[in-house]
């Protein structure tokens, strides 16, 4: 039909466009003609894939017309001037909106060209991680909570430990109808080890620049770990006072320590103060056995030590620890 | 008021040609494509061809195979269709009609017979 | 060449009766469609473009829809003056190509 050997005219259209659910968004659509080429629009047409009708049209007389006057308008087309760009925007962004449409020309004398794009209506999550506060379970359990609330499509959550363990993701429908809220646990066994350590969540999602890190420090409760420190093997009599430390980790902190011995309350020379045990000068050897036990909320553990003070004072001063 | 007034009948014997007038007021001429259909009597509408006034660009319906020719007078707002080779089945009422993508007016008609 | 197919070719009607004409394409033609009224001794006059919308001066009782391939042209409540033919027309692809007509006559 056109005259053989002429440049065809193009129409121009990305193959897919974003909007985000209640924002507007243009769907660009331009007729690219060649310099020597020559064309006239009569008629700028948009439909929907799957819809009978179109959904917009302008008319080189009758100007715009509209399916839904509201909430359509082309961007740039006017009467009384070359009907070349049929960009299109659309307030209000519903979720039913996505979906594929045709950009359609009807020129002289080429005939109509046209061109499909897809709209993408997405929806920006919002993201929060948490911890789940666990204790000594010995299975595995939620440690962490990471969370991205009313996406679309639904964000991928990913995670990254140090620690072990492994995910366990679940998705439920948004609070916007066609919006997805992604919930995605960290689950491993429980340990004191485990108790002040870090997990990352990571979410992805095509409405972000770059991913979201969310790090969630964890809390694991476990009674007290004891251990008391402090002796060395080598006190004697006659030397300055030394002292014990009763070490305890737990979670909750300690809420109080008990010095004791296997045969029962503490002898003159050793005096609690706290979570230290002082013990005073002797003239006599000693061999006792000292025990510190030690509370918190989830219960009480305890630690023993054996000390030793011995005749004899050694070689070079070491013994009992100088304050 | 947009005007399309055309030519008078025409009667022509076979073999001949004939070339009918489309005289248009009421808009600017250049700025739509001018198109010609036409209607044996009693019978449906076929479209012949189209031109553009300001570029000269057209398009045929390849059925008319060369024997149409489309023309126009810019300074007279006035386009011409030219039909050669006449035979019988050529008689009908030939319109021309302002194009829009559709057709939204029309010249009042030409009837062309071909006779012997 | 794309083919239209109209029917009824010929239908009558009472004033206040709904009358549906359809037109079907023999391939896909989107909604490059337009309708047209013919009165007799009269030239064809412009009814519908883009398959659904009609001329401004155009009775709101004219209503055309449909995409694709079917397409249909509703008058809502006949009057005497619509009286005529009528014929849709695709301008999808060249050739242009019309319908073969319905003949709408007033019981």
């Known amino acids: 039909w056109p005259p053989p050997g002429t440049g065809d005219i193009i129409v121009q259209a990305p193959t897919q466009v974003p909007g985000f659910l209640g924002d507007s968004v243009t769907l660009p659509c331009y007729l690219q003609v060649p310099g020597m080429e020559e064309t006239h629009v009569s008629q700028l047409t948009w439909s929907r894939h799957g819809e009978s009708g179109s959904m917009a049209v302008f008319h080189q007389t009758q100007g715009p017309n509209y399916s839904e006057p509201k909430r359509l308008e082309f961007v740039a087309a006017r009467l009384g001037t070359e009907l070349r760009d049929a960009s299109l925007r659309m307030f209000g962004l519903r979720v039913e909106d996505e979906g594929n449409y045709t950009c359609l020309f009807v020129t002289f004398p080429q005939g109509s060209r046209s061109v499909d794009i897809w709209l993408r209506v997405l929806a920006k999550p919002q993201n929060t991680a948490e911890v789940q506060k666990v204790q000594l379970t010995g299975k595995p359990v939620p440690v962490a909570r990471c969370v991205s609330t009313g996406g679309r499509p639904p964000a991928h959550i990913t995670w990254h430990s140090d620690l072990g363990g492994m995910p366990n993701t679940s998705q439920a429908p948004g609070f916007l109808s066609g919006t997805v809220t992604v919930t995605s646990l960290w689950i491993l066994v429980p340990s004191s080890q485990v108790d002040g350590k870090s997990v990352t969540c990571k979410v992805e999602h095509e409405s972000f620049e770059k991913p979201q890190l969310l790090t969630v420090n964890l809390t694991v409760y476990y009674p007290p770990e004891v251990s008391i420190s402090g002796y060395d093997n080598n006190w004697y009599l006659s030397q300055n006072e030394a002292t014990l430390t009763c070490d305890a980790r737990s979670n909750p902190e300690p809420t109080g320590y008990n010095w004791s011995t296997t045969m029962g309350p503490l002898p003159p020379f050793a005096v609690a103060q706290g979570a230290q045990l002082l013990i005073r000068p002797v003239d006599k050897p000693i061999n006792t056995t000292f025990i510190c036990n030690v509370t918190n909320a989830l219960g009480a553990r305890q630690a023993e030590l054996t000390v030793q003070v011995k005749e004899g004072p050694p070689s070079e001063p070491s013994g009992m620890s100088s304050n | 008021e947009v005007q399309l007034v055309q030519s008078g009948s025409e009667l022509k014997k076979p073999g001949a040609s004939v070339k009918i007038s489309c005289k248009t007021s009421?808009?600017?001429?250049?700025?739509?494509?001018m198109h010609w259909v036409r209607q044996p009597h009693g019978k449906g509408l076929e479209w012949i061809g189209g031109i553009h006034p300001n570029s000269g660009g057209t398009s045929y319906n390849q059925r008319f195979k060369g024997r149409v020719t489309l023309t126009v007078d810019k300074s007279t707002s006035t386009a011409y269709m030219e039909l050669s080779s006449l035979r019988s089945e050529d008689t009908a009422v030939y319109y021309c009609?302002?194009?829009?993508?559709?057709?939204?007016?029309w010249g009042q008609g030409t009837l062309v017979t071909v006779s012997s | 060449d794309i083919v239209m197919t109209q029917s009824p070719s010929a239908m009558s009607a009472s004033v206040g009766d709904r009358v549906t004409i359809t037109c079907k394409a023999s391939?896909?033609?989107?909604?490059?469609v337009a309708w047209y009224q013919q009165k007799p001794g009269q030239p064809p006059k412009a009814l519908i473009y883009?398959?659904?919308y009609r001329y401004s001066g155009v009775p709101d009782r004219f209503t055309g829809s449909g995409s694709g391939t079917d397409f249909t042209l509703t008058i809502s409540s006949l009057q005497a003056e619509d009286l005529a033919e009528y014929f849709c027309?695709?301008?999808?692809?060249?050739?242009?190509?019309f319908g073969q007509g319905t003949k709408l006559e007033i019981k």
């Open positions: 009421g808009y600017t001429f250049t700025e739509y494509t």
């Open positions: 391939q896909n033609v989107g909604t490059n």
């Open positions: 883009s398959a659904s």
């Open positions: 027309q695709q301008y999808q692809s060249y050739p242009y190509t």
């Open positions: 009609a302002r194009w829009t993508g559709d057709f939204d007016y």
